[in-house]
């Protein structure tokens, strides 16, 4: 990139520029014409016969350097060929001499600084590539000449130009003073500002683009040349900050469209909202999620949003006693999340109908909540107990819902305490043929004992067939039809409104061998 | 501004020669292009011929060849035009003009003439 | 030499008409063609260099086009003031300066 600090070419009014010295043949200005036809202003000297020696001087006016530390002079200029020139001296030349001054300010005057090699600083000495001649009975026929001349290194705030001719017939048709500068670049989201540099090479610090992020590593810089040119070199660069993708080329970060997002910064493109997510505005990170579905506060932020699951469905319960087996079938919407567990809820209702939550007594196995598998086994059910059950279905954002949870309820009613086990049997009296037993009357807790049932079989014949029931309704029984001297063994349950209790333990007992030891009491 | 100030009005026999001067007043002369038109009474114009002083030698139209010498002073600013075997169909006004770029001064080698003398009568009569 | 013919040999016209006058070279001159005004007992005055290049201080209503063999030039609107006679002229690199026999304007 190339910073004009003169352009003749754009001057419209006079240049009045400073000559030296003031006498006839000296540089002179005129009105020219460029090859756009345009109207240019120029300078022109043409003293070929002049004494050797002498100098005629044009000096620009005062250039501020504006920073630059090297500037470079295009020269366009027109020469005559000395052969062409009948009455043209030896002191004819073909070439002029360019150099600066530098200062501070615009001090220069008409004698100052002295017209001179030091302290003017000679630039170089300018020969002409093309030189316009003329021979007799044809026209003159020349070509402009085009010569670029770098000034430099420059401290002070500006300078002046100058040239000197000895002896040349040219004119100087356009000086176009510029220095060179590394234009404003953007590359990889990184913007380098635009540079003019002070050496070969001058290293620029970038800094990222709106709505980028500098990436891991060093930060990113990018070589100014002298030439204005910037340096091939990679660049670590910035990458978009969430929310924002590159665009135009890696030159700038768009904000993610309504209905996109992008989570993290760095390279990658913003992606449509995952499922049951929005987001109603541009540049997002994160989609909102709709009303009802949730993310917990696991899942990464381009997750899909989900929702709690349904209800389990169809509880089978199976009472044993004090145990019961709960099973269920998973819920028909798992939310669309794999972090299916299961909980449950109790409360029981005793017989004269309060209720409250189940008490501590009861367990759970495997537990009552945080289950995996669709069943439990609770133990410790008391009897005459109703238990409700509710079966819930949790997932990873149950917990942030609101509302009701939804539930599988399931009623179970234990039957009411029966009697306990007729223990301590013992045998009144012993015959040959009969038994005549007693035992303790059992405590029955719901209710009292409406009867007894007592079972006996011979030792030995352990068959179904072999196996004999009575019922009384007292706590004692006579067994009769027994065979003589055989071993009998005797268990009772007691009966009350619940129903019977557990057998008790087998009682062993034997009739007598013959009718004469007659009736014999046996006491426990 | 360049001013061109031609010589008076000339009388001459036919068969004679007449020479008109024209001088420029003021900055570069010597690469300016100065030519010579004519222009006879109730006529259009006629260019006759041009010269750069700084290269000597003038160009002439194929008509005015060998009768007519067009030379130039850079010391005193000052070209001539010597016109020779006058005839009677001479007469004429005879203006010098100065083209508008010098030799080094335009892209193109345009010979545009922005300056003219006032004009000499020359009167060719026996 | 290259001849130079310019059409009408004159014309009448009115103030505020558009005005065209032609130059025909009898061979290619690309576009080295000058375009002078001269009013009578004046010298000739350079309106148009270059074919189309209106010279300093012309009107702009004054305007020149053409290229190689055929030229115009046109007054867009014609002021009192204008009425003269017109010249084209030739230049090339082979020495002379052709006029054409020109063009008088007259008020209609």
């Known amino acids: 990139l190339e910073e004009t600090l003169l352009n003749t070419k754009l001057e419209t009014a006079d240049l009045k520029w400073v000559t030296f010295p003031q006498v006839d043949g000296q540089w002179e200005e005129l009105s020219g014409l460029d090859e756009e036809q345009h109207s240019v202003r120029t300078y022109e000297v043409c003293d070929v016969q002049r004494a050797p020696g002498q100098a005629h001087w044009l000096r620009t006016g005062w250039v501020p350097r504006r920073g630059a530390v090297h500037v470079y002079a295009t020269l366009r200029f027109t020469m005559l060929e000395c052969l062409s020139l009948p009455r043209a001296g030896r002191s004819c030349k073909e070439t002029f001499t360019v150099f600066y001054y530098e200062s501070d300010a615009d001090t220069a005057t008409a004698l100052t600084p002295a017209w001179m090699e030091n302290p003017y600083i000679k630039v170089d000495t300018v020969a002409a590539e093309h030189l316009t001649r003329k021979r007799p009975g044809a026209e003159a026929t020349g070509k402009v000449n085009v010569k670029t001349l770098r000034l430099g290194p420059l401290s002070k705030a500006g300078f002046y130009l100058a040239f000197q001719d000895q002896g040349a017939c040219m004119a100087l048709l356009s000086l176009h003073l510029f220095y060179k500068k590394c234009a404003q670049l953007t590359v990889n989201l990184t913007r380098f500002p635009e540079t003019v540099p002070r050496e070969l090479v001058v290293p620029v610090a970038g800094s990222c683009v709106v709505d980028a992020v500098p990436a891991p590593g060093p930060s990113p810089s990018l070589y100014c040349r002298e030439d204005g040119q910037w340096a091939e070199q990679p660049v670590t660069g910035c990458s978009c900050a969430p929310g924002f993708e590159a665009a135009e080329g890696n030159t700038k970060c768009r904000a993610c469209a309504q209905g996109t997002f992008k989570p993290l910064s760095g390279e990658g493109s913003c992606q449509p909202c995952p499922a049951n997510s929005h987001s109603n505005t541009i540049g997002s990170a994160v989609c909102q999620c709709r009303v009802g579905y949730f993310r917990a506060r696991t899942d990464p932020r381009g997750a899909p949003c989900t929702t709690p699951p349904s209800a389990p469905r169809s509880v089978v319960s199976r009472l044993n006693g004090s145990s019961l087996h709960l099973e269920w079938s998973a819920p028909l919407e798992s939310g669309g999340r794999e972090d299916l567990t299961y909980a449950l809820r109790c409360r029981e209702c005793r017989p004269g109908g309060s209720c409250a939550p189940c008490g501590g007594d009861l367990t759970f196995d495997p537990g009552p909540r945080d289950l995996v598998e669709p069943w439990v086994v609770v133990r410790g059910l008391r009897p005459d107990f109703t238990y409700t059950f509710e079966v819930t279905a949790l997932n990873g954002v149950s917990s942030l819902a609101t509302g009701p949870v939804p539930f599988e309820p399931v009623n179970v009613t234990t039957d009411r305490e029966v009697p306990p086990a007729v223990s301590d049997i013992r045998v009144t009296r012993s015959s040959p043929s009969s038994l005549s037993l007693a035992w303790a009357v059992p405590r029955a807790p719901s209710g009292a004992v409406l009867d007894y049932e007592v079972k006996y079989h011979e030792k030995g014949a352990e068959g179904p067939s072999s196996v004999r029931f009575l019922k009384t309704s007292e706590n004692r029984a006579e067994l009769r039809g027994l065979k003589r001297g055989a071993s009998y063994l005797v268990q009772v349950r007691a009966r009350s409104e619940a129903g019977y209790g557990p057998f008790g333990q087998e009682h062993h007992s034997q009739t007598q061998l013959d009718e004469s030891e007659g009736w014999r009491e046996q006491l426990a | 501004q360049v001013q061109l100030v031609q010589s008076g009005a000339e009388v001459k026999k036919p068969g004679s020669s007449v020479k008109v001067s024209c001088k420029a007043s003021?900055?570069?002369?010597?690469?300016?292009?100065i030519s010579w038109v004519r222009q006879a009474p109730g006529q259009g114009l006629e260019w006759m011929g041009k010269?750069?002083?700084?290269?000597?030698?003038?160009d002439y139209a194929q008509k005015f060849q060998g009768r007519v010498t067009i030379t130039a002073d850079e010391s005193t600013s000052t070209a001539y035009m010597e016109l020779s075997s006058l005839r009677s169909e001479d007469t004429a006004v005879y203006y010098c003009?100065?083209?508008?770029?010098?030799?080094?001064?335009?892209?193109?080698?345009?010979?545009?003439?922005?300056?003219w003398g006032q004009g000499t009568l020359v009167t060719v009569s026996s | 030499d290259i001849q130079m013919t310019q059409s009408p040999s004159s014309l009448s016209a009115s103030v505020g008409d558009r005005v065209t006058i032609t130059c025909r070279a009898s061979?290619?001159?690309?576009?080295?063609l000058n375009w002078y005004q001269q009013k009578p007992g004046k010298a000739p005055k350079l309106l148009i260099y270059?074919?189309?290049i209106l010279q300093s201080g012309v009107p702009s209503r004054f305007s020149g086009s053409g290229s190689g063999t055929d030229f115009t030039l046109t007054i867009s609107s014609l002021q009192p003031e204008d009425f003269a006679t017109y010249y084209c002229?030739?230049?090339?690199?082979?020495?002379?300066?052709?006029f054409g026999q020109g063009t008088k304007v007259e008020i209609k």
């Open positions: 270059g074919s189309s």
């Open positions: 002229q030739q230049y090339d690199f082979y020495l002379s300066g052709t």
């Open positions: 003021g900055g570069t002369f010597s690469t300016y292009a």
């Open positions: 003009a100065r083209s508008s770029y010098t030799i080094l001064t335009t892209y193109y080698n345009y010979n545009a003439m922005d300056n």
């Open positions: 010269i750069i002083p700084i290269f000597g030698d003038a």
């Open positions: 061979q290619n001159i690309n576009n080295f």
